[in-house]
């Protein structure tokens, strides 16, 4: 019968969420260990009745209206480990009378986010918390951190300060936190990190500030543990000096104003010529650094949405562990990775939405690359084996370029064309919007693609045998918006084809699928189909799940197969109610309303629907 009382009780967990409670109930089980009172209208927290529940380990008081904490309100809760007071009104003066939260001897996580707390006030609120591991002060109104902000928290490991208005962090503000490993300072108003010295820190989020420079402290023997650094959405002009951070695995520098230098640094050490755009590229580590090869452990680097025009050869040299590199939305005109062993571990390279005209990939560079994103560039005359050289390439997106595919080995095609045959690892290829005029025979021979998108190439001519060799592998084929009047592709031979998009062409006939195939989705929108005869579509009945037909001049009569699907078939015809057909009289009606008796001999109709 406990389901009929407002709070839900299971084992020693009690949930009293969003019940409009004005006070803590006095009638909960005395051995309750987890109590969720979030989303109520509690205004004050008193020692009675809260102190009745001495077994509490988890207490959630978030999203209430708490502005008063009775001194010693949590004193009786000697087992309390997790306390959330997030999204209340603790900044109101009454919350802080006589000692704030008081000592919290066993609390390991404390959430005070969203309380409009401001600097100075926080120090009065936080009491002694010797076991505290995790503290959230996010979404408050803190403007500065001092040496006194975080005292009596020797065990603190994770500190979340995101979404405050921090402008100033006093030297030594984190000195009393020797175990701090995770620090989130995102969404603040910091402008400069001039002396980063938190050696034990492993994760640092500085995203969404106004940081113009990031500099580590000049401690030659320092062993920085930082593995994860997020500096996205700042105002960095240069690649930051990270030579002192040899353990970095993840680095996000997207959405800054970074430009990489165009020539070698003027300074012999290579780390101090900011006028040239150098703020220490990962070229040389300071002497005494344990690693000696800065960024050699980096796995993920995001430099998207910057102002990079050129990648110097030396920039990629030490990134020997890099798996993911995002350079999209920059100003690159050329990209080169020609050196043997260049970026040997790279699996994903995103160069999309730049201004790339040339791309030079060495025969044995990028040996692990699986995904190459090049959409939204200006690639035109590439060396023919640009992609054939990439031994592990599985996914290639070339949408919005001007790439012309060569034919098969027997029909190489014009100069400047790119070979897509013989790339045995390639599975997905997008050639959308490349102004391709002719797809030559054998273009994809010995390239077992499962997905091929050739859409938005108006005037495309698909030569006989252009898709030859894909019959046993292709699962998704898109030819949308090409103005095709005839399809020179023997579709029924593509036994694995699951999704076929032929929308926005001028097709009026399909080949006959007489035997069962795998096709599940067929998009024929905005073509010139008047009839879909059962003789052609019969083989699709067992597999087809979805058929798109809007925008075709369908005939009301002679479409028996289609009518059957609309009424009781397994095929889901999209927008059935809006599917319009025409009688010979040119009268338009909804196809779903047509009855067999409406179609008389000769296709005439003299009955008013």
């Amino acid at each position: 019968h406990q389901d009929k009382v407002p709070c839900k009780m299971v084992d020693k967990k009690v949930s009293c969420q969003v019940l409009g409670l004005l006070q803590v109930p006095s009638v909960l089980p005395p051995d309750t260990e987890t109590l969720d009172l979030s989303g109520n209208q509690l205004r004050s927290i008193l020692a009675s009745p809260l102190g009745f529940y001495t077994a509490l380990r988890h207490l959630d008081l978030s999203t209430n209206e708490i502005s008063f904490l009775q001194p010693g309100a949590f004193q009786a809760l000697t087992h309390l480990e997790h306390l959330s007071l997030a999204h209340n009104r603790l900044a109101m003066a009454t919350a802080l009378s006589a000692g704030g939260l008081g000592p919290l001897p066993r609390v390991t996580s404390l959430d005070l986010s969203g309380n409009s707390l401001y600097s100075g006030l926080l120090e009065r609120l936080l009491g002694e918390a010797p076991s505290l591991h995790t503290l959230s002060l996010a979404e408050n109104s803190l403007t500065r951190l001092t040496r006194h902000t975080f005292r009596d928290m020797p065990a603190l490991e994770q500190l979340d300060l995101h979404s405050n208005v921090l402008m100033d962090i006093e030297d030594g503000a984190f000195e009393g936190l020797p175990r701090l490993t995770h620090l989130n300072l995102s969404r603040n108003s910091l402008t400069c990190i001039s002396d980063f010295s938190l050696q034990q820190l492993r994760v640092l989020d500085l995203s969404c500030n106004s940081i113009e420079a990031f500099q580590t402290a000049s401690q030659p023997q320092a062993e920085f543990q930082l593995t994860w650094l997020d500096l996205r959405e700042n105002k960095l002009l240069h690649f930051p000096d990270l030579a002192a951070l040899p353990r970095l695995i993840y680095l996000n520098l997207s959405n800054n104003l970074i430009r990489l230098p165009t020539g070698p640094p003027q300074d012999s050490k290579g780390i101090h010529a900011p006028s040239e755009g150098w703020s220490a590229l990962p070229l040389s580590a300071p002497s005494g650094n344990a690693s000696g090869r800065p960024l050699s452990q980096l796995l993920n680097l995001d430099l998207s949405y910057n102002e990079i025009e050129l990648i110097p050869d030396s920039f990629l040299e030490h990134l020997t562990s890099l798996c993911f590199l995002n350079l999209s939305r920059n100003c690159l005109r050329t990209f080169e990775a020609r050196r043997l062993g260049s970026l040997p571990c790279l699996m994903l390279l995103d160069l999309s939405h730049n201004a790339l005209e040339t791309l030079e990939l060495g025969a044995r560079a990028l040996g692990s690359l699986r995904t190459l994103l090049l959409q939204g560039n200006a690639l035109r005359d590439l060396p023919p084996y640009t992609f054939a050289n990439l031994a592990s390439l599985q996914r290639l997106n070339l949408q919005g370029n001007r790439v012309s595919p060569c034919g098969g080995p027997d029909e190489p095609g014009p100069s400047g064309c790119v070979a897509f045959s013989g790339i045995t690892s390639l599975r997905s290829l997008s050639l959308v919007d490349n102004e391709i005029e002719l797809l030559r025979a054998g273009a994809f021979l010995h390239t077992p693609l499962t997905e091929l998108d050739l859409s938005s190439n108006p005037g495309l001519e698909v030569a006989t045998g252009a898709l030859g060799g894909l019959e046993a592998s292709l699962e998704v084929l898109a030819l949308q918006g090409n103005g095709l009047m005839v399809l020179q592709v023997d579709l029924p031979c593509f036994i694995c084809l699951k999704r076929l998009n032929l929308a926005e062409n001028r097709l009026s006939h399909l080949p006959a699928w007489t035997q069962a195939v795998s096709l599940e989705v067929l998009d024929l929108r905005n073509n010139s189909f008047s009839l879909l005869p059962g003789s052609a579509m019969g083989g699709l009945e067992t597999s087809l799940r979805r058929l798109y037909l809007q925008g075709n001049p369908l005939s009301c009569c002679g479409n028996g197969w289609l009518a059957a699907q609309l009424h009781q078939g397994r095929v889901d015809v999209d927008a059935t109610q809006d599917l319009i057909c025409r009688f010979s009289s040119q009268e338009e009606v909804s196809l779903s309303h047509v009855r067999p008796e409406d179609c008389e001999k000769g296709g005439l109709k003299n009955i008013n629907l």
Epitope: K4, V5, P6, K12, L21, L22, Q23, P25, S26, V27, L28, P29, P30, D31, S48, P49, G51, F52, T54, A55, A76
Partner: antibody
Framework: QVQLQQPGPELVKPGASVKLTCKAS????????MHWVKRGPGRGLEWIGR????????HYHEKFKTKVTLTVDKPSSTAYMEFSSLTSEDSAVYYC?????????WGQGTAVTVSS | DIQMTQTTSSLSASLGDRVTISCRAS??????LNWYQQKPDGTVELLIY???TLHSGVPSRFSGSGSGTDYSLTISNLEQEDIATYFC?????????FGSGTKLEII
């Protein structure tokens, strides 16, 4: 099934003390408050107080604070109410009752008579 | 302390009648109201808790309603075994307090 067993009547002299017992069975003893209620002759019911068996923490009605002490023995799942300095006013039937939202199971009550 | 008032100390009704017993709190008790039945032999049972929730095993002819400060217990079809004294109790705020009781008799 849930049972609260209280012993038979007690005859006590004025000024003396008495310790009433309530043995619980059939449920997790520490998951419910144990309440004590007085029914005086010709009177209604009066709430004396309650105790949390898991911690031994007790809450009393102001009226009984100096008169009554509530305790528990967890291993034997037994609750106790000790009365001190008894007077004739304390002659009544005393019930123990288990309960959180409501006192859903009651003992049969122990009649205490204070007489010289 | 919150005072609980049962204005009707005794009530007479016939078998089969619909009987309503009322209870008023001196302040809002947020539905934390229980009803108890004390039989002539002294045994006490919980009938309804949290204003309207029927305790297990209690016949469905008993029902409770109310909010704020005013609450009531209704017996829809009075039976012989319902002869007893009925007490309301608030458990919103310590100390928990009982009403003075309403004694139900058969005419």
């Amino acid at each position: 099934q849930v049972q609260l067993q209280q012993p038979g009547p007690e005859l006590v002299k004025p000024g003396a003390s008495v310790k009433l017992t309530c043995k619980a069975s059939g449920y997790i003893f520490t998951s419910y408050w144990m309440h004590w209620v007085k029914r005086g002759p010709g009177r209604g019911l009066e709430w004396i107080g309650r105790i949390a068996p898991n911690s031994g923490g007790a809450h009393y009605h102001e009226k009984f604070k100096t008169k009554v002490t509530l305790t528990v023995d967890k291993p034997s799942s037994t609750a106790y109410m000790e009365f001190s300095s008894l007077t004739s006013e304390d002659s009544a039937v005393y019930y123990c009752a288990r309960g959180n939202y409501g006192m859903d199971y009651w003992g049969q009550g122990t009649a205490v008579t204070v007489s010289s | 302390d919150i005072q609980m008032t049962q204005t009707t100390s005794s009530l007479s009704a016939s078998l089969g009648d619909r009987v309503t017993i009322s209870c008023r709190a001196s302040q809002d008790i947020s539905n934390y109201l229980n009803w108890y039945q004390q039989k002539p032999d002294g045994t006490v049972e919980l009938l309804i808790y949290y204003t309207s929730t029927l305790h297990s095993g209690v016949p469905s002819r008993f029902s409770g309603s109310g909010s704020g400060t005013d609450y009531s217990l209704t017996i829809s079809n009075l039976e012989q075994e319902d002869i007893a004294t009925y007490f309301c109790q608030q458990v919103n705020t310590l100390p928990f307090t009982f009403g003075s009781g309403t004694k139900l008799e058969i005419i």
